[in-house]
Structures are given as structure tokens and as C-alpha cells.
Interface confidence: low
């Protein structure tokens, strides 16, 4: 399927609107500090060039690869050295090394100001004045803050963003209509970004075998009526799509994703009965719908797994003949029978099964050796079941904020070297598992909770890789993708940690605390809590609770005072002294 001009091929396949959007996303994800106008200029130049290639595929430079074309364009940015430092050295390299270099410089935590939401009337005016620019600005701002955001999915978010403004800017109460929609898009967007970051980490750090195993398990849960060969085909195609997007090949990724959606809709009968309503939708919506589709019903008459994978005398023969196919089939068969298990648990079970076969197929009596393999799965299954049960009980008892605080303390004690902002961000997100998963029926709790925790812990791993400070974090993040969560769960208080010296500055608060939103107030308090634990890692729950209760009372008192700043100046040092005494 070779084309004389790759850029013309993609422009024709995707259409101008999607082509321009994806190029803007690609450039914004690579050059995250560049101003919006600079990116728009580059995109327009690339688009005009693509059009000349559509008109004549033999025109000059039209035969160049997309990496060459895009890389050459990025390297024309005048301020590359001043803005990006050593990233400018990428431009001295040839493809494919130049693109690899750009990828390595993507920053998961760019030093960009938080997005401030203007007044609704201001946003509506901007939307009506220049809708195209308004939507491009959205793509740019999200892409530069989330350099691994799944690009075709970001186009879908932009379409929803546009629809929200088109509807609400005509409404009687614009704010009541628009703000909940924007909140929903923000929260869904952050979740989508984090999920995609795990897919890219899986591919980049553990290889496509790890990603394919994840995909076999997940798709087998979703499509339990599909044949293994059908699931295998979907896995191969999905792996290609995500490899491309994670590698910055956004045009190819979006094109292949559209092809995959087309294939799934043309072959619904052999995939799932749940695809019908997705397949009537327009492209972006259809692809999103297919990705989020609920699990199909399990076939009623599935036989016991034991016959083929334990009792059969041919287990070692089948395993030796084609290891990955046999293990893939085992994973498929197990996953389609267990929508109640997390994908990570299913992968641990497949890993345990593989280890048993490696050992037993070399033994004198292989069948005798692997006969009890399913019994060995029990502790692996019970561990996440118990973890979910205990943490949901704690969540129900404490509520979200205090549950987050419990996790903040737990994780700060485990890995106190990690920066306070990272511990606060990660623990707050870990704490959101309660509201997200604990309300679900028993059969959906574990897949919801553990697979969500894997996404959140990947964020910790990604941030820690940028600035490594803890050998324990490095070990949990790099040794095994499927065992990351159990690895972190198993960490105890770090006895080797030297407590942080007390710094009164850290616990000095001002009247601006009173004007913060509830969420911002929580973050301030939680930041203080982390610092307290870093100062006194062996403080008991009761001691920490006492200090935090005093802190809340002190803030509440001063925010009610006439002269707030004077109150903070007077009461602050008393609070610090009382806290030090309580923790002594």
C-alpha cells in the first residue's frame, strides 16, 4: 500500500479539517512552549504544501516522509535553542533519529500556567468572533499540556467543545448550560490523557508484546463471543494504531483508527452485539463509542478451561509449538470468562501460567507438575479482591477528602523522597477511585479500581522518571508493568529516610487562603499534611488527625475574622508551635 506522496495520501484520506487539526496537535505536543500563532503559521504552511502534493504527487519534496517534512518544519522555528535548550540538537540529526530525539524531549509536566477559564460572555464572544481560531486554541492548549493525548480522540473532544459553545451561547442562562459541560470535558479529558499515557508507557517501556497482552485481555472481556482469531486481528490493528500515535505519527494513527472502526462495523456479527449503536454515528463519535463500548454478554455454554489448559496431555506440546499463540489463547479464554477481573490481574494469571509451563514442561512428569496450576491462582485473585474491599470500606467510612488524606499519609510514608506536589496530585487521584468504583456492583469493582489505579500510578512513574529520587519508586515502575500496583501496595514505611528539617515557611499561611475554591483549599491542606509526614514520618494517625483538625479550625477562624491577614499573622505561629508540640 505504497503511495508516491505520503502527505497527499493522508490529506486525501483525512480531509483538510482533520489533517490541519492533527498537524496542529502534533506540533503542539512536540514544541510545547511555542506560542499559538507560531504553530498556526507552521500548520498553514504544511497544509498549503500538502495541497500542492494532492494536485501533483510528483511535485518537489512530495515524496518525502512525514517525519522528514514535519521535522524540517519544526526545525525552522527561530527561537528553538533559546526556548528548548538541548532539544535544538535534535535538528542536527537525520531521520529517524531526529524524530526519536523529539519524542524523548516531550515533557509530561511542562512549566505552563494552569488554564484559567474566562467569563462565559467573554468565551462566547470569542467563539462567535472566530470559531476556527477558538477551536484551534483548544487543541493547542490541551495538546501542549498533554503531549501524549490520543490525537484522534482529541479531535472528538474538540467537536464536543464546539457543540457545547454552539448550544450554550444561545441559551437564556449561558453559564448554567456551559459550565457543567466544560467541567465534564475537563475531567474526561484528564482521564483520557492519563489512560493514553499508560498505553504509551506500556509500548515504549515494555514493548509491543506487553501492549498486545493487555489488549488481548481487554478485548476478550469486551467481546467474549468473538473468536480468538478475530480478537487477534483487532489486537494487531489496535497495536498499530497506538504505536503510531505514541510515536508521534498522528496522521497515520488517525487514518488507521478510522479503518479499524470501519472494519469493526462491517464485521459486527463476528465481534459483538453491542456495536450497533456506535456504528450509526459519524466517524469521531463512532471511534470513541467503539473504544468505550460495554462488555458483550458471555456465551452461555463456555466449557471449563481446565480441559484444554490443565487436564490435556497436549499442553506442553501445544505450548512448545507456538508459545505466544498458546498463551494468547489462554489469556483470551480466561478473560472472556472473567469480566469481573481487572486486566492487570488477568495478565498476572497469564504470567503465572507461563512460568508454571516453563518449569513443568521441562520436568520428568509435566502433567503431574502443572496439575495444580489453577490452585496457584487463588492468592493472586484474592489480593486485589481484599484490597478493593478494604479500601472501599475505608472510603465509605471517611468520604473522599479524608480518604485522600489517608492515602497521602500512606504514600508519603512509603516514598517520602518524592516531591510534595507529585505526592499530592497522585494521592488525590488515587483517592478518586472511591467515588468512581466503590458504588459499582461487586462484579465491576475490581476491574474499575485496579485498572484505574494502574493509570494513576503510571503518572507517578512518568513524573518520577523525569526527576528520579527514590530507588523504591524506580524499582516498582520498571520491574514489571503488571505488578506495579502490588509493588506499591507492598511498600512499607521507609526506615532509611532521614526526616525533613522543620521549615516554618512551609506552614505559614495568609489571607489569600480564604478566597480559594474548596478544591484549592483542600490542596493547600493536603500539601501541609504531606510536609508534616515528611517531617515526622512516624507520627501516628491520631497525631496527624489532631494537627489537621487544628489547622482546619485555625483557617476557619481567620477567614471569619475582620482583619484576616492580622489573624493569620498572629494565630499562624501559635498553630505551628502547637503542631510541633503535638508531634514531638
Amino acid at each position: 500500500d505504497t503511495h508516491k506522496s505520503e502527505v497527499a495520501h493522508r490529506f486525501k484520506d483525512l480531509g483538510e479539517e482533520h489533517f490541519k487539526g492533527l498537524v496542529l496537535v502534533a506540533f503542539s505536543q512536540y514544541l510545547q512552549q511555542c506560542p499559538f500563532e507560531e504553530h498556526v503559521k507552521l500548520v498553514n504552511e504544511v497544509t498549503e504544501f500538502a495541497k500542492t502534493c494532492v494536485a501533483d504527487e510528483s511535485a518537489e519534496n512530495c515524496d518525502k516522509s512525514l517525519h522528514t517534512l514535519f521535522g524540517d518544519k519544526l526545525c525552522t522555528v527561530a527561537t528553538l535553542r533559546e526556548t528548548y535548550g538541548e532539544m535544538a540538537d535534535c535538528c542536527a540529526k537525520q531521520e529517524p533519529e531526529r524524530n526519536e530525539c523529539f519524542l524523548q524531549h516531550k515533557d509530561d509536566n511542562p512549566n505552563l500556567p494552569p488554564l484559567v477559564r474566562p467569563e462565559v460572555d467573554v468565551m462566547c464572544t470569542a467563539f462567535h468572533d472566530n470559531e476556527a481560531t477558538f477551536l484551534k486554541k483548544y487543541l493547542y492548549e490541551v495538546a501542549r499540556r498533554h503531549p501524549y493525548f490520543y490525537a484522534p480522540e482529541l479531535l472528538f473532544f474538540a467537536a464536543r467543545y464546539k457543540a457545547a459553545f454552539a448550544e450554550c451561547c444561545q441559551a437564556a442562562d449561558k453559564a448554567a448550560c456551559l459550565l457543567p459541560k466544560l467541567d465534564e470535558l475537563r475531567d474526561e479529558g484528564k482521564a483520557s490523557s492519563a489512560k493514553q499515557r499508560l498505553k504509551c508507557a506500556s509500548l515504549q517501556k515494555f514493548g509491543d508484546r506487553a501492549f498486545k497482552a493487555w489488549a488481548v485481555a481487554r478485548l476478550s472481556q469486551k467481546f467474549p463471543k468473538a473468536e480468538f482469531a478475530e480478537v487477534s486481528k483487532l489486537v494487531t490493528d489496535l497495536t498499530k494504531v497506538h504505536t503510531e500515535c505514541c510515536h508521534g505519527d498522528l496522521l497515520e494513527c488517525a487514518d488507521d483508527r478510522a479503518d479499524l472502526a470501519k472494519y469493526m462495523c462491517e464485521n459486527q456479527d463476528s465481534i459483538s452485539s453491542k456495536l450497533k449503536e456506535c456504528c450509526d454515528k459519524p466517524l469521531l463519535e463512532k471511534s470513541h463509542c467503539l473504544a468505550e463500548v460495554e462488555n458483550d454478554e458471555m456465551p452461555a455454554d463456555l466449557p471449563s478451561l481446565a480441559a484444554d489448559y490443565v487436564e490435556s496431555k497436549d499442553v506442553c506440546k501445544n505450548y512448545a509449538e507456538a508459545k505466544d499463540v498458546f498463551l494468547g489463547m489462554f489469556l483470551y479464554e480466561y478473560a472472556r470468562r472473567h469480566p469481573d477481573y481487572s486486566v492487570m490481574l488477568l495478565l498476572r494469571l497469564a504470567k503465572a501460567y507461563e512460568a508454571t509451563l516453563e518449569k513443568c514442561c521441562a520436568a520428568a512428569d509435566p502433567h503431574e507438575c502443572y496439575a495444580k496450576v489453577f490452585d496457584e491462582f487463588q492468592p493472586l485473585v484474592e489480593e486485589p479482591q481484599n484490597l478493593v474491599k478494604q479500601n472501599c470500606e475505608l472510603f465509605e467510612q471517611l468520604g473522599e477528602y479524608k480518604f485522600q488524606n489517608a492515602l497521602l499519609v500512606r504514600y508519603t510514608k512509603k516514598v517520602p523522597q518524592v516531591s510534595t506536589p507529585t505526592l499530592v496530585e497522585v494521592s488525590r487521584n488515587l483517592g478518586k477511585v472511591g467515588a468512581k468504583c466503590c458504588k459499582l456492583p461487586e462484579a465491576k469493582r475490581m476491574p474499575c479500581a485496579e485498572d484505574y489505579l494502574s493509570v494513576v500510578l503510571n503518572r507517578l512513574c512518568v513524573l518520577h522518571e523525569k526527576t528520579p529520587v527514590s530507588e523504591k519508586v524506580t524499582k516498582c515502575c520498571t520491574e514489571s508493568l503488571v505488578n506495579r500496583r502490588p509493588c506499591f501496595s507492598a511498600l512499607e514505611l521507609d526506615e532509611a529516610y532521614v526526616p525533613k528539617a522543620f521549615n516554618a515557611e512551609t506552614f505559614t499561611f495568609h489571607a489569600d487562603m480564604c478566597t480559594l475554591s474548596e478544591k484549592e483549599k483542600q490542596v493547600k491542606k493536603q500539601t501541609a499534611l504531606v510536609e508534616l509526614v515528611k517531617h515526622k514520618p512516624k507520627a501516628t494517625k491520631e497525631q496527624l488527625k489532631g494537627v489537621m483538625d487544628n489547622f482546619a479550625a485555625f483557617v476557619e477562624k481567620c477567614c471569619k475574622a475582620d482583619d484576616k491577614e492580622a489573624c493569620f499573622a498572629e494565630e499562624g505561629p501559635k498553630f505551628v508551635a502547637a503542631s510541633q508540640a503535638a508531634l514531638a
Epitope: 468473538a226 473468536e227 480468538f228 482469531a229 478475530e230 487477534s232 486481528k233 472494519y263 464485521n267 456479527d269 463476528s270 484444554d308 501445544n318 509449538e321 507456538a322 499463540v325 498458546f326 489463547m329
Partner: nanobody, 115 residues
């Protein structure tokens, strides 16, 4: 690497017979259901027939029911399609696939029914 190689196609007169074979390698053949699919010039792929892993359950599209018979030999890792009472509309490239997929995983073998 999974490989499927079809053979047995050719030119045959209407009412004639052919037997297609599909030799499989690179996977545990005896654990998979298999299908025959065909694609006529200028048309999309059409599922023809399927057989389960053990060979006990066979299925056919309405257009070939009663004329074609699917079978397998797991020891030889080979899938067969016996085609009788062939008609001009059976003219197509025939290829075998794992499971019920209609996605082409092989070159196929050409069957032409013409007088």
C-alpha cells in the same frame, strides 16, 4: 508466524467439482475454528463456510448449502473445501481464515467456473 497456504483451485465447467486445501502453520491448528471465504472480482469478501476446532460443527452460507462440504484433518494441519455442482457465480478467489474473520490473511486460490 501464522501462515495459511491454499491450493486446488482451477478452471472447471459448470456442474463440475473441485477440492480446495489449506495448509496451516505457526499456530495450534487443532485449537481453532476455521473458515473459507471468497472474493469475486470487484466485490467484497463473502464468508462461505466454517468448521469448529474438533470438526463436529460445520456451517454454510445459503448460497453454497448442499453443494459444498467443509472438513479438516488436525493431524495434517489442513482444512478442506469439497465443492460440487459448481456454478459460474462461484467464480472467485477462495481463501481460508482462522475463526470467522473475513479479513484476508493469505493469497488464496483462484476458482473459475466457465464453459
Amino acid at each position: 508466524q501464522v501462515q495459511l497456504v491454499e491450493s486446488g483451485g482451477g478452471l472447471v465447467q459448470p456442474g463440475g467439482s473441485l477440492r480446495l486445501s489449506c495448509a496451516a502453520s505457526g499456530f495450534t491448528f487443532g485449537s481453532f475454528g476455521m473458515s473459507w471465504v471468497r472474493q469475486a472480482p470487484g466485490k467484497g469478501p463473502e464468508w462461505v463456510s466454517a468448521i469448529d476446532s474438533g470438526g463436529g460443527d460445520t456451517r454454510y452460507s445459503d448460497s453454497v448449502k448442499g453443494r459444498f462440504a467443509i472438513s479438516r484433518d488436525n493431524a495434517k494441519k489442513t482444512l478442506y473445501l469439497q465443492m460440487n455442482s459448481l456454478k459460474p457465480e462461484d467464480t472467485a478467489a477462495y481463501y481460508c481464515t482462522i475463526g470467522r474473520s473475513t479479513s484476508r490473511g493469505s493469497q488464496g486460490t483462484q476458482v473459475t467456473v466457465s464453459s
